[in-house]
């Protein structure tokens, strides 16, 4: 195994030694420790946790552990002027008000500083008006409302159910539709799995539970006031009017008990089809406004949150590499939570803590990795990936020259059914090989490999006998590393059975009920799934930092590039006449993909045969592998999204959580039949094909023999 050939190696100090040192009981203890009080970004409690982690990582044996602070824009409710929503009668009297807080879970009644549910970065305002129900507030939902049902949301307050897409996209869509306020709610159809009790008796969302979350549309900018640059002591800050990604209309989240009170009175149009109906006992009428008896009643929002520049703290730990200290493998996950963070993020932070401890143990015994490993505890992820982005902005020159890989470590679990991996194609073979060596924790797969249970439960849609690996999207701290800097990235966690559980995320996501007990009682009592995730994340970091030849296979990129080219061509061929009229051809892209495939194949042959004892040639080959991901970066970025620079992947313009392939071409084609100037629109399609074809060809040439 390549990892046996690391420096200062004794038979004891190999991947097995690292993996064997990881203990479920430790992860459990760390999770308990990290979840007893809230750790909201920008608060004293989260600063204290940062210092605790710094101290413990030093004790574990890292070479150095530093705090990196930034002053970024955050958002908080007004403690003396709470946010709520009312139904008002014709006299303006409030006849119903939504709740001001979630009922605290058992054992947490006396905990202070539980932030009430709010939509971070909502502007202040008290709009009142008629309600329109907009389903999930997706692009296609507004198309249905506006184009098919001829319902105008202008000047209305819209109510949307959480799920399917990132909440910031919902708010953006509502703004574009002319809405003057947005109410977000959790429908039991999406956040209450059948046959499971609500917390504290099960893992389902109670009626008073509410999902917090930011509603920004940052598109990778980081701190809204300092896009592109770190929010340091001498930063120039934009005025709030020029800040990136802030919503322009008030937004507030509620639970399904309160949603019932708003939705039961809805009149106007019936829902267009069954996909617009949730599970509440309400008609799911679209509106606008309330039905006959209640037609004079209106909805009023009362939002008083404030945006404040606040100090945040990342913890950065270093384990110096013995042979290539200037090559960085990064393991990072966030520390800040909305409340207790039982799953998000502390189930991930506890795993990182145990991985650091295991690496530290090996280091104390005289071992070092071949390459430098950086460990990060990011702050303010919940407020827009701010900690990771500011640190990467500050260190961008180092990272773009030295960054080998980034492994993300947010929530370790969102279910307990099977593994879920999203990563660059360069890591497919690494993930496959690693999971074949790990034991499955799943019932019914005793003595079988993780690869086997994963493949059985989550098969690849394209390749039989292989597991599904998804594209990276965003909504987590890998974003800046992958989408902006072009550093090979991956993430892994245990997930639910998507076939049988159609709810979005996990039911208690970002609620006060995301506690240690939720995990310990209902998700992973033995912490065996956490341990497996630690083995996957830690094993990936170990191999990336220690193998003599980087464990990247460029041939897998060739395969997906062909798949993505076929897909975007198929989308374009929906418009055969326009393709003909405007002479749109994908020949250049298919030619570039063909060249990439041939060059990648030849590179892989050379990789098998070269003299690994020659450090110059070894470094040269490894640099070609390291810089391949970087070669997909377009310095000009995507149209109107300058910080999304990866030409092959970007977060979907319609759902930040999802990844889109050839996003430049995809967005140019999207809804093209509605564009007022088809010639201009198809010209942009042609330009994007040109950019994509050039980028793929240029990336291919980085794998050619250097002379």
């Amino acid at each position: 195994k390549s990892s046996n050939e690391a420096t200062n190696i004794t038979p004891k100090h190999n991947m097995k030694a690292f993996l064997d040192e990881l203990k479920a009981e430790n992860i459990k203890k760390f999770l308990y420790n990290f979840t007893q009080i809230p750790h909201l970004a920008g608060t004293e409690q989260n600063f204290q946790l940062a210092k605790q982690i710094q101290s413990q990582w030093k004790e574990f044996g890292l070479d150095s552990v530093e705090l990196a602070h930034y002053d970024v824009l955050l958002s908080y409710p007004n403690k003396t002027h709470p946010n709520y929503i009312s139904i008002i009668n014709e006299d303006g009297n409030e006849i119903f008000n939504t709740s001001l807080f979630e009922p605290p879970p058992p054992g947490y009644e006396n905990v202070s500083d539980i932030v009430p549910p709010f939509s971070a970065f909502s502007p202040q305002g008290m709009p009142e008006g008629d309600l329109v129900y907009v389903n999930y507030a997706r692009t296609e939902d507004f198309f249905k409302l506006e184009r098919d049902m001829k319902i105008n949301c202008s000047g209305k307050i819209v109510i949307a159910r959480y799920g399917k897409v990132f909440r910031g996209n919902k708010v953006k869509n509502a703004q574009l539709a002319g809405a003057k306020g947005v109410i977000l709610y959790s429908d039991p159809a999406d956040y209450f799995a059948p046959g499971v009790k609500s917390y504290p008796d099960g893992w389902n969302l109670p009626g008073g539970g509410v999902q917090r979350g930011n509603i920004l549309n940052l598109n990778g900018a980081g701190d809204p006031l300092t896009p592109g640059y770190p929010a340091n002591e001498y930063a120039y800050r934009r005025g709030i009017a020029e800040a990136v990604g802030l919503p322009s209309i008030p937004v507030h989240p509620i639970g399904y008990y309160d949603a019932q009170k708003l939705l039961e009175k809805m009149g106007g149009s019936a829902p267009p089809d069954s996909s617009w109906r949730g599970s509440l006992k309400v008609p799911y009428n679209v509106g606008p406004g309330f039905t006959g008896n209640f037609s004079t009643q209106k909805v009023k929002m009362h939002i008083h949150s404030t945006n404040e520049v606040t100090r945040i703290y990342n913890v950065i730990g270093t384990l110096r590499g013995a042979v290539e200290p200037d090559r960085y493998v990064i393991l990072g996950g966030h520390r800040d939570s909305w409340v207790f963070g039982g799953i998000d993020p502390q189930s991930g932070a506890a795993v990182v803590h145990e991985i650091v401890r295991s690496f530290g143990t090996l280091k104390k015994e005289g071992w070092r990795p071949r390459r430098t490993i950086l460990f990060a505890s990011w702050d303010a992820e919940e407020f827009g990936l701010l900690g990771s982005t500011e640190w990467a902005e500050e260190n961008s020159r180092l990272l773009q020259e030295r960054g080998v890989a980034y492994i993300n470590a947010d929530s370790s679990i969102e279910g307990n059914y099977t593994l879920r991996v999203d990563c660059t194609p360069l890591m497919y073979s690494l993930v496959h090989n690693l999971t074949k060596e790990l034991k499955s924790p799943d019932e019914g797969f005793e003595g079988k490999s993780l690869y086997e249970s994963w493949t059985k439960k989550s098969p690849s849609p394209e390749f039989s006998g292989m597991p599904r690996i998804s594209k990276l999207g965003s909504g987590n701290d890998f974003e800046v590393f992958f989408q902006r800097l072009g550093i090979a990235s991956g993430r892994a966690r245990y997930t639910k059975n998507w076939e049988t559980n159609k709810f979005s995320g996990y039911p208690l996501y970002h609620s006060v009920y995301e506690t240690y007990e939720l995990v310990e009682k209902f998700y992973d009592p033995m912490f065996k799934y956490h341990l497996t995730v630690a083995q996957v994340r830690g094993g990936m970091v170990f191999e990336l930092a220690n193998s003599i030849v980087l464990p990247f296979d460029c041939r897998d990129y060739a395969v997906v590039l062909r798949k993505y080219a076929d897909k975007i061509y198929s989308i374009s061929m929906k418009h055969p006449q326009e393709m003909k009229t405007y002479s749109v051809s994908f020949d250049s892209l298919f030619s570039a993909v063909k060249n990439f495939t041939e060059i990648a194949s030849k590179f892989s042959e050379r990789l098998q045969d070269f003299d690994k004892s020659n450090p110059i040639v070894l470094r040269m080959m490894n640099d070609q592998l390291m810089f391949l991901e970087r070669a997909f970066i377009d310095p000009l970025g995507l149209p109107d999204r300058p910080f999304y620079r990866h030409v092959i992947y970007a977060p979907s313009s319609h759902n930040k959580y999802a990844g889109e392939s050839f996003p430049g071409i995809y967005d140019a084609l999207f809804d093209i039949e509605s564009k007022v100037d088809p010639s201009k629109a198809w010209g942009e399609v042609k330009r994007q094909i040109y950019v994509a074809a050039f980028t793929v060809q240029a990336a291919a040439e980085t794998l050619s023999e250097v002379a």
């Epitope: 198929s570 989308i571 061929m573 055969p576 006449q577 393709m579 003909k580 039949e673 509605s674």
Partner: antibody
Framework: EVQLVQSGAEVKKPGESLKISCKAS????????IGWVRQMPGKGLELMGI????????RYSPSFQGQVTISADKSINTAYLQWSSLKASDTAMYYC???????????WGQGILVTVSS | QSALTQPPSASGSPGQSVTISCTGT?????????VSWYQQHPGKAPKLMIY???KRPSGVPDRFSGSKSGNTASLTVSGLQAEDEADYYC??????????FGTGTKVTVL
């Protein structure tokens, strides 16, 4: 050679459900729209709706919206037209046709006669 | 969108010409050069005869021709033959993946 082969004639009772098919061969099924066209006895052609098999994007003509469902299975190069509850007035010949550049229906299936009678 | 208007019937003797009109609006026939014509013999599937107003697919005799003026398209069959007796339908693209069919014209060869 491009071919659209439709399933056989159907005789059904009112209220019954029905799914008829159109199997394509000789071309890249996923990258051409398929249309379904109704011809009632002694009447003209009416476009019911179209589907793009690659992503199952479906557009219905207003008078057929909610009355029928058009679908496609790209793994077997087949488009479908279905009813959940047939009426006597659904008695007609149903054609599938491929749509290509120039917005034209260049290849047609042989047609399926559906008879709905109690 | 309403169906395109065609005359219910047209006729001519062998060797003569017959012209069928197809009237729409500026949103369909008048707005796009995407009018096509289909021939349907009894009990058979329609067959494409003309596309993009004037173009003929290979295999279609050159006695079939198409034209357009304003919101009205026309199909002319010159040198009428017995096998040309059939129903003829026009169709026009109407934007945003919408299509409109004509009401149909029965051509009789006297």
């Amino acid at each position: 050679e491009v071919q659209l082969v439709q399933s056989g004639a159907e005789v059904k009772k009112p209220g019954e459900s029905l799914k008829i098919s159109c199997k394509a061969s000789g071309y890249s099924f996923t990258t051409y729209w398929i249309g379904w066209v109704r011809q009632m006895p002694g009447k003209g052609l009416e476009l019911m709706g179209i589907i793009y098999p690659y992503d199952s994007d479906t557009r219905y003509s207003p008078s057929f919206q909610g009355q029928v469902t058009i679908s496609a299975d790209k793994s077997i190069n087949t488009a479908y037209l279905q009813w959940s509850s047939l009426k006597a007035s659904d008695t007609a010949m149903y054609y599938c046709a491929r749509i290509t550049g120039g917005y034209l229906f260049d290849y047609w299936g042989q047609g399926i006669l559906v008879t709905v009678s109690s | 969108q309403s169906a395109l208007t065609q005359p219910p019937s047209a006729s001519g003797s062998p060797g003569q010409s017959v012209t069928i009109s197809c009237t729409g609006t500026s949103s369909d026939v008048g707005g796009y050069n995407y009018v096509s014509w289909y021939q349907q013999h009894p009990g058979k599937a329609p067959k494409l005869m003309i596309y993009e107003v004037t173009k003929r697919p290979s295999g279609v005799p050159d006695r079939f021709s198409g034209s357009k003026s304003g919101n009205t398209a026309s199909l002319t069959v010159s040198g009428l033959q017995a096998e040309d007796e059939a129903d003829y339908y026009c169709t026009s693209y109407a934007g945003s993946n919408k299509y409109v069919f004509g009401t149909g014209t029965k051509v009789t060869v006297l």
